[in-house]
Interface confidence: low
Amino acid sequence: EEELQVIQPDKSVLVAAGETATLRCTATSLIPVGPIQWFRGAGPGRELIYNQKEGHFPRVTTVSDLTKRNNMDFSIRIGNITPADAGTYYCVKFRKGSPDDVEFKSGAGTELSVRAKPSAPVVSGPAARATPQHTVSFTCESHGFSPRDITLKWFKNGNELSDFQTNVDPVGESVSYSIHSTAKVVLTREDVHSQVICEVAHVTLQGDPLRGTANLSETIRVPPTLEVTQQPVRAENQVNVTCQVRKFYPQRLQLTWLENGNVSRTETASTVTENKDGTYNWMSWLLVNVSAHRDDVKLTCQVEHDGQPAVSKSHDLKVSAHPKEQGSNTAAENTGSNERNIY
């Protein structure tokens, strides 16, 4: 009779993480008598996966009933596959011996490859805010995928970015892999509503890539522009001085009025109006009683925005003659009346 052959018909098997792997093995003869064992890897360091004769293997089930005398199918199923299960599995026939069974013949081996999905990409931006025209870096990370091949793209508002660097680790063979990418993004004044997107495509995702996003509203600081204007109101001895604070982001802003260098009033921006681009406008005003002044008055609007050094704009109020209209209040965003007479 022809000598027993151990046949593993599949050179490789590919399984998704969490699923069950079927490793096929048949023998061509019932002789010699003896058990089958499955190993991962070859040589002295091989790992026992299943022993027909003894042991407890909770994740392994046999395809056929191995207790039947004429059984020659030694295929097994391994449940709940993880990337750590990847490797080459050998079906090995043992010959009954005393005291120990003797290895008789091994199958050619079946390579088990595991497909694992990447984790959702996490995008993180710079720790501190930056102003328009500056370049900032964003990082994107995703972990736990297999096989190693993966594609990562960056987008800003749907436009693909080209300035980025990507690494997949580790470089050598591993049960699973991680990807890390850093993209450079130039900020513009219109970026309050912008998004940066990291998109990861992998064979396990069936053409439906994973995306991680970062809102540039968390990253950008748009400094305000200031304009101080005056015009007469009510009686001829009162002048309305306004400070228009335009196009700033985020909202955190404190305004101080100075009269000839002395603090007159400090207030925090509260009822602001929002522009279409996501920036804010705000206006503060003073009613100045010019009859109380013999000399010209230097009024300064000083703004501290988002913890940055203060910026200011000054206006010289002439008191030597009746005040004439000097500019006009073109802001439509008057949101509050803050009156104070200067004596």
């Epitope: 599949d10 098997v13 590919l14 998704a16 792997a21 096929r24 199918d73």
Partner: antibody, heavy 122, light 107 residues
Framework: EVQLVESGGGVVQPGRSLRLSCAAS????????MAWVRQAPGKGLEWVAS????????YYADSVKGRFTISRDNSKNTLYLQMNSLRAEDTAVYYC???????????????WGQGTLVTVSS | DIQMTQSPSSVSASVGDRVTITCRAS??????LAWYQQKPGKAPKLLIY???SLQSGVPSRFSGSGSGTDFTLTISSLQPEDFATYYC?????????FGGGTKVEIK
């Protein structure tokens, strides 16, 4: 609804080439092994070739080895059979079929496409 | 290559009859066997896989048995729509091979 639609069949002269396509829909194509099986007029079924989910393993019948190439494009949900050096005995209806179990070897097949007729004649 | 031999090559039967088709493999294939039904001008349809597992949607009057080299497909009560050709197929070794087919005809 799971569907497999073959195309590319026709009349071709001996020695020429033909490429068959099989468009899959209604299931996750990238999870299943695929195969081509043919049936000569009035004859039984003959397995031609099989391919693993990711294209890493390809198997061929001895009668077509070296002449036919099975391939797949998972992004297009399409299976292909490139047939070169065609012979009169390759005349048959060619069916594409999908493996029953996900991520397994292409062992048994269901469903099958409606088939496309290849006629090799001078 | 594994040869798959089906018998009989054809069988005449009436509606309600019990029909048995056998398939023999030239060497042991454990339970790696499938049965298909094919009607004229149509693609084959899987009935049984793993020798005895009924494919979803297939009527329970179809059953499969056997292991190793000898396998049987049984139709417990033949229905009009069952008149067709039936093929067995081994699924353990490449090349995959089919039996020659059994035609079930109306008596």
């Amino acid at each position: 609804e799971v569907q497999l639609v073959e195309s590319g069949g026709g009349v071709v002269q001996p020695g020429r080439s033909l490429r068959l396509s099989c468009a899959a829909s209604g299931f996750t194509f990238a999870h299943y092994g695929m195969a081509w099986v043919r049936q000569a007029p009035g004859k039984g079924l003959e397995w031609v070739a099989s391919i693993w989910v990711d294209g890493s393993n390809k198997y061929y019948a001895d009668s077509v080895k070296g002449r036919f190439t099975i391939s797949r494009d998972n992004s297009k949900n399409t299976l292909y059979l490139q047939m070169n050096s065609l012979r009169a005995e390759d005349t048959a209806v060619y069916y594409c079929a999908t493996a029953v179990e996900t991520y397994s070897g292409p062992n048994w097949f269901d469903p099958w496409g409606q088939g496309t007729l290849v006629t090799v004649s001078s | 290559d594994i040869q798959m031999t089906q018998s009989p090559s054809s069988v005449s039967a009436s509606v309600g009859d019990r029909v048995t088709i056998t398939c023999r493999a030239s060497q042991g294939i454990s339970s790696w066997l499938a049965w298909y039904q094919q009607k004229p001008g149509k693609a084959p349809k899987l009935l049984i896989y793993a020798a005895s597992s009924l494919q979803s949607g297939v009527p329970s009057r179809f059953s499969g048995s056997g292991s190793g080299t000898d396998f049987t497909l049984t139709i417990s009560s033949l229905q009009p729509e069952d008149f067709a050709t039936y093929y067995c197929q081994q699924a353990i070794y490449f090349p995959i091979t089919f039996g020659g087919g059994t035609k079930v005809e109306i008596k």
